[in-house]
Interface confidence: low
């Protein structure tokens, strides 16, 4: 189920799958929620540690049992991923951090009158992931009111420094507040050029697009269908970026599909999950568990309830079935996507719905005049 | 909201506007989305207007002037007013609205978490009141949703300021000694929310106060934690399943 409590002065030992710098525990928790394997996290605020390299450190952790030993560490904050937490799952992070400089690649500098305007500029710039703003009282006069738009390879700061009269924050694109607008079109038989930032296997272009939308550096994508001429590239989803923010060229190419990230959509973003079930398809991955269940929908529910399960295959082979129940293979991988996609099998596959934010699950632990 | 500032899109996605359509249509009260099909508000919003057909509930909006005849709204299936609420008193000023159709959650329309039953131990230091109500005592409904940061005050302190009224344990007060920031007419039924451990919780329902934002006259809110049993009972008995965001 959903666990929202935070543990003050506690640090989870072991289980590290990734680390990064984040300005606070809530942002660290959000990164954990969206990381395919993270179940637990520990965060070290600046006040909790003398080691400059580990200040603002966010450590994402996995555990086969779903828990890790807690050690006492003054100032540290630990907690759980919000996978399975229904409507609390959101990549939107509005907070502005005073006295903090989030470092990254500075690609744009302009003078603005407020930190809110700086955040707006970041939100309205296709490449901006986070920003820093030097206030009116910054010690170097020439930098005052400077708004620095930034990005980094992982979408999080490359370093975070305590610095007076500087305020930092993140783009509000994941809040569906970008004024840029988005291209909803899917372009059949068209391949985009430019830089590949990641490669995953997906069953269709729509899953590819959702993964692109929630990848920090993906601006557009090309998907190679299951009838693409090169067998090793079938079902490959290439996540892409470019300096300009749009593809510099596109090539007509049979059995490819291209499109854009939907992160810049205004008012509606796709859910960070994939609910479709794919008949006749087998998703390969690391086996987490095998259980007998009645029907593919129950298999998907079982996967969703098992927090580490990322995707599943429900087999309809006679040898995999007992009366009305058949084998439900619960699987996972390093990146959350199948390691192999096979067609023409007797069965169906699909994804866990643990990141769907429409769940109804109960997720909130934690003489006069009327008006 | 007196002394407030404009909110931005999706900042308070649980805030709804309760509007009445008679000859004209107007905003009367706020409310808080607590589940796909449930809104929590103040009982006094329905004083003299208990007919569910006249009400329109707008969710996922920021600016009332954006509402046109084509703007989607929810209609009421059922109004559940607390059985002990009396029009002449300020006690038990709480009501549940069951919507005719469930709402989908988006970044701009999602529920607020409810507190734990009888939550008295949590010390809330970051509390906000929101609404489209008057910006001064003799004011008018605001177009853009307003927000204001107001500290909670103890019930003893609040009782000192309201000698003629009983401030019960089922109420919570918020305000500045010097005044200047407060809820006002039209904010009724809306949320008093507090952020604790990174999570927003519905601590109070805007209920009453002496004028608006007056010195040493805090706003009085219905304390949601004290009504958790009632909320759970009503939402579960209505359709056999808890439909709101209750504590795990």
């Amino acid at each position: 189920g959903c666990l929202t409590q935070l543990y003050e002065n506690a640090f989870f030992r072991g289980g590290d799958v990734a680390s990064m710098y984040t300005p606070n525990a809530q942002y660290c928790q959000m990164r954990c929620t969206f990381h395919p394997r993270c179940l637990l996290f520990s965060f070290l605020p600046a006040s909790s540690i003398n080691d400059m390299e580990k200040r603002f450190g966010c450590f994402l952790k996995d555990s086969v049992t779903g828990t890790l030993p807690k050690v006492h560490r003054t100032g540290a904050v630990s907690g759980h991923s919000l996978k399975q937490c229904g409507h609390q799952i959101s990549a939107c992070h509005r907070d502005i951090y005073k006295g903090v400089d989030m470092r990254g690649v500075n690609f744009n500098v302009s003078k603005v009158s407020s930190v809110e305007e700086c955040q707006k500029r970041c939100t309205s710039n296709i490449r901006c992931q986070f920003f820093s703003y030097a206030t009116q009282t910054f010690h170097k006069a020439e930098y005052r009111n400077n708004c620095l738009l930034k990005y980094s390879p992982g979408g999080t700061p490359t370093a975070i420094k305590v610095l007076s009269n500087v305020e930092s924050g993140f783009s509000l694109k994941p809040c569906a507040l970008s004024e840029i607008g988005c291209h909803m079109n899917i372009f059949q038989h068209l391949a985009f050029s430019d830089v590949d930032v990641a490669r995953v296997l997906t069953p269709d272009a729509f899953v590819c697009r959702t993964i692109c939308t929630y990848h920090p550096n993906c601006l557009f994508f090309t998907f190679y269908t299951n009838v693409w001429k090169i067998e090793s590239q079938r079902n490959v989803c290439l996540l892409k970026t470019s300096e300009s923010g749009t593809p510099s060229s596109s090539t007509p190419q049979e059995n490819t599909i291209s499109g854009y990230s939907l992160l810049t959509c205004k008012r509606t973003l796709p859910e960070p999950c994939h609910s479709k079930i794919y008949p006749g398809v087998d998703f390969g991955g690391e086996e987490l568990n095998v259980t007998f269940v009645k029907g593919v929908n129950v298999c998907q529910e079982t996967c969703t309830k098992m927090i580490r399960c990322q995707f599943f295959t429900y087999s309809l082979l006679p040898e995999d079935c007992k009366e009305e129940k058949c084998k439900c293979f619960l699987r996972l991988s390093m990146d959350g996507s199948p390691t192999r996609i096979a067609y023409g099998t007797q069965g169906s596959s699909g994804y866990s719905l643990r990141l769907c934010n429409t769940g109804d699950n109960s997720v909130c632990t934690t003489k006069t005049s009327t008006r | 909201i007196v002394g407030g500032t404009n909110s931005s899109w999706g900042e308070w996605p649980w805030q709804v506007s309760l509007q009445v359509k008679l000859t004209a249509q107007r905003h009367l009260c706020g409310g808080s989305l607590i589940g796909h099909q449930w809104v929590l508000t103040a009982a006094h919003c329905f004083d003299g207007l208990p007919l569910q057909d006249v009400w329109r509930i707008y969710s996922g909006i920021l600016n009332l002037s954006d509402i046109t005849k084509d703007t989607p709204f929810s209609q009421i299936k059922e109004i559940i007013i607390h059985q002990n609420y009396k029009v002449s008193e300020g006690n038990h000023d709480i009501a549940l609205i069951k919507l005719q159709a469930p709402l989908n959650y988006t970044e701009f329309q999602k529920p607020i978490c409810l507190p734990s039953k009888g939550d008295t131990s949590t010390i809330y230091t970051n509390c906000w009141v929101t609404g489209w109500g008057f910006s001064k005592e003799k004011g008018e409904i605001q177009n853009i949703l307003q927000k204001v940061n107001i500290p909670l005050v103890t019930n003893e302190e609040c009782q000192k300021r309201y000698q003629d009224y009983k401030i019960t344990q089922r109420m919570v007060c918020a305000g500045y000694k010097e005044g200047g920031k407060d809820a006002c007419k039209g904010d009724s039924g809306g949320p008093l929310v507090c952020k604790h451990n990174g999570m927003w919780r519905l601590v109070g329902i805007t209920s009453w106060g002496e004028g608006c934002a007056r010195r040493e006259q805090p706003g009085v809110y219905t304390k949601v934690a004290e009504y958790m049993d009632w909320i759970l009972e009503k939402t579960q008995s209505s359709d056999g399943k808890a439909q709101m965001q209750s504590p795990a």
Epitope: K120, S124, E179, I180, N185, T246 | -
Partner: antibody, heavy 122, light 106 residues
Framework: EVQLLESGGGLVQPGGSLRLSCAAS????????MMWVRQAPGKGLEWVSG????????VYADSVKGRFTISRDNSKNTLYLQMNSLRAEDTAVYYC???????????????WGQGTMVTVSS | DIQMTQSPSTLSASVGDRVTITCRAS??????LAWYQQKPGKAPNLLIY???TLESGVPSRFSGSGSGTEFTLTISSLQPDDFATYYC????????FGQGTKVEIK
């Protein structure tokens, strides 16, 4: 009826200033990105500046950056263009425009005002 | 910045002729292109948006095609009311107009 009505044009000397207004009616002004587009006598159309619905984000063509300021008053349903340090090449008919539908930033302009003439000459 | 180049700059044609105007973008703009018609002393009038979508109320003799960097406006059978100046406009990155094509009577 949807209408845009520009005003404030006239003759001004090089280096001078002028403020154009565009009064909007018949639609919810505060929803839309608004634009200024100009057309020099006998020449083509040139996009000058745009302002997003909230007024918080403004964009300018390189030719006017630092000299022109676009603003809006949603309560008055009015769009403005403050033009400073005017040059002879700013002489043009100035139109305000917007698009009734479509996703912001992906906008064609299907509603135009009738234009106001600005002449910069000594 | 994205530059838009229209050709030809002037086109002489007769009523009933099929007329084609081209517009080239300096970089890919996908389908984010509009075509306008303007008559002397009047504001421009939107004909086509998203490269090929006909604006409501515009006669079906007008059509648009293309994507990426190459776009075309076609008038299948020129009518007396069609003698005017035509502009293309990109809105992929901010807004830029082509320099215009004047369609005059031969």
């Amino acid at each position: 009826e949807v209408q845009l009505l520009e005003s404030g044009g006239g003759l001004v000397q090089p280096g001078g200033s002028l403020r154009l207004s565009c009064a909007a009616s018949g639609f919810t002004f505060s929803h839309y990105i608004m634009m200024w587009v100009r057309q020099a006598p006998g020449k083509g159309l040139e996009w000058v500046s745009g302002i997003y619905s909230s007024g918080g984000i403004t964009v300018y063509a390189d030719s006017v950056k630092g000299r022109f300021t676009i603003s809006r008053d949603n309560s008055k349903n009015t769009l403005y263009l403050q033009m400073n340090s005017l040059r002879a090449e700013d002489t043009a008919v100035y139109y305000c425009a917007y698009r009734r539908t479509g996703v912001p930033r992906r906008d064609e302009f299907d509603i135009w005002g009738q234009g106001t003439m600005v002449t910069v000459s000594s | 910045d994205i530059q838009m180049t229209q050709s030809p700059s002037t086109l002489s044609a007769s009523v009933g002729d099929r007329v084609t105007i081209t517009c080239r973008a300096s970089q890919s703009i996908s389908s984010w292109l509009a075509w306008y018609q303007q008559k002397p002393g009047k504001a421009p009038n939107l004909l086509i948006y998203k490269a090929s979508t006909l604006e409501s109320g515009v006669p079906s003799r007008f059509s648009g095609s293309g994507s990426g960097t190459e776009f075309t406006l076609t008038i299948s059978s020129l009518q007396p009311d069609d003698f005017a100046t035509y502009y293309c406009q990109q809105y992929n990155t901010y807004w830029t107009f082509g320099q215009g094509t004047k369609v005059e009577i031969k």
